[in-house]
Amino acid sequence: TIDTKRNISAEEGGSVILQCHFSSDTAEVTQVDWKQQDQLLAIYSVDLGWHVASVFSDRVVPGPSLGLTFQSLTMNDTGEYFCTYHTYPGGIYKGRIFLKVQESSDDRNGLAQFQTAPLG
C-alpha cells in the first residue's frame, strides 16, 4: 500500500518535500515515477538511479529517500502530484498529493503594511 499526506501546503518561493511511503511484506520497489498532473517530474529506478526531467531540473532535487524536494515554488505549482511505484512481484501502486502553494507571509505582511500606511 501507499501512504502519503493527501494535502500539503507551502509558500511561494519556498520548497516542499513530496513523499510517498510504500509498504509491503513481499514486493520490492523497482521504479518510482513522479508526475505533476500529467507531466513527468522525475524517475527513480533501482538499476539507473534518479533522472529529473529537463523541464524541472533547476527546481527538483531527488530525495529524501524516494521522494522529491520541489524548490522555488510558484502559484502555478498548485495542483495534483502523483507517485507511481512499480514493484515486483506486486505490480503498480499509485499515490496522490494535492499541493497548495500560498502567497508568502512576507508578501502578505508587506502588502498589508503598504495598504495601511498613512498617506501623509
Partner: antibody, heavy 118, light 107 residues
Framework: EVQLLESGGGLVQPGGSLRLSCAAS????????MHWVRQAPGKGLEWVSS????????SYADSVKGRFTISRDNSKNTLYLQMNSLRAEDTAVYYC???????????WGQGTLVTVSS | DIQMTQSPSSLSASVGDRVTITCRAS??????LNWYQQKPGKAPKLLIY???SLQSGVPSRFSGSGSGTDFTLTISSLQPEDFATYYC?????????FGGGTKVEIK
C-alpha cells in the same frame, strides 16, 4: 561514449533465418532495457521487440511473434535477435536501441540491413 | 494497440520559419510521448522525451507540449540542419508505436 553496433544482417531467402547482434559499449549494459526497431525501405519506424535489464520481461510485435526471439548476454554486453521463418515483409534496416526507465529511446545503433528475397 | 497519427505528413518551410507538427494518440497516453528526428541514411535521434523535456544537447529551438491524446512539436526558428523527418512515439504500453512521420522539406 555510448555506442551500439549492430551486425548479422544480409540477404536471406524467404523461410530462412538470421541472427542479429548488437554490441554495446560506453555504459552499464546490464542496467538498461534494450529494444529492436526496424524500418522498411522508404517507410516509417516499427517497433519489433524489447527485453528488460535482467531478461525477465520480453515483448514482441504481433507481426514477429512466434518467429523472432530476443535475448541478451549481460556478460558480453550484447543484445541478440534470432529471426526465423523470414518473409519478404521483414526486409528492413534493424536498429538496436537503449531505453532508460522503459520510457524513451535515448541511443540508437547505426542499423543493419536485412533483405529477404529469392 | 495505440495508434499514433501525425500531421502533416510533409511540409515545406523556409529557414527562420516557425514549424509545428502534431501527433494524436488513439487513447490517452498521459505524457508517455517522445519525438525523434531522422535524416536520410541515419539512425533516429531523440529530441523530446516525456512530451515536453528537451534531451541533453538538443537546441532550445525545439520544444514539445501536450498530454493525454494531443501533442505538438515546435521548431521556433527552422535552421538548415533541421530539414529531416520527425516521428512521435508512445511508450505508454506495448506494442510501442510510432507516428507515420513528418518530412520537413526546403521551400
Amino acid at each position: 561514449e555510448v555506442q551500439l553496433l549492430e551486425s548479422g544482417g544480409g540477404l536471406v531467402q524467404p523461410g530462412g533465418s538470421l541472427r542479429l547482434s548488437c554490441a554495446a559499449s560506453g555504459f552499464t549494459f546490464s542496467s538498461y532495457s534494450m529494444h529492436w526497431v526496424r524500418q522498411a525501405p522508404g517507410k516509417g519506424l516499427e517497433w519489433v521487440s524489447s527485453i528488460n535489464s535482467n531478461a525477465g520481461t520480453i515483448s514482441y510485435a504481433d507481426s514477429v511473434k512466434g518467429r523472432f526471439t530476443i535475448s541478451r548476454d549481460n556478460s558480453k554486453n550484447t543484445l541478440y535477435l534470432q529471426m526465423n521463418s523470414l518473409r519478404a515483409e521483414d526486409t528492413a534496416v534493424y536498429y538496436c536501441a537503449r531505453v532508460p526507465y522503459d520510457y524513451w529511446i535515448d541511443y540508437w545503433g547505426q542499423g543493419t540491413l536485412v533483405t529477404v528475397s529469392s | 494497440d495505440i495508434q499514433m497519427t501525425q500531421s502533416p505528413s510533409s511540409l515545406s518551410a523556409s529557414v527562420g520559419d516557425r514549424v509545428t507538427i502534431t501527433c494524436r494518440a488513439s487513447q490517452s497516453i498521459s505524457s508517455y510521448l517522445n519525438w525523434y528526428q531522422q535524416k536520410p541514411g541515419k539512425a533516429p535521434k531523440l529530441l523530446i522525451y516525456a512530451a515536453s523535456s528537451l534531451q541533453s544537447g538538443v537546441p532550445s529551438r525545439f520544444s514539445g507540449s501536450g498530454s493525454g491524446t494531443d501533442f505538438t512539436l515546435t521548431i521556433s526558428s527552422l535552421q538548415p540542419e533541421d530539414f529531416a523527418t520527425y516521428y512521435c512515439q508512445q511508450s505508454y504500453s506495448t506494442p510501442l508505436t510510432f507516428g507515420g512521420g513528418t518530412k520537413v522539406e526546403i521551400k
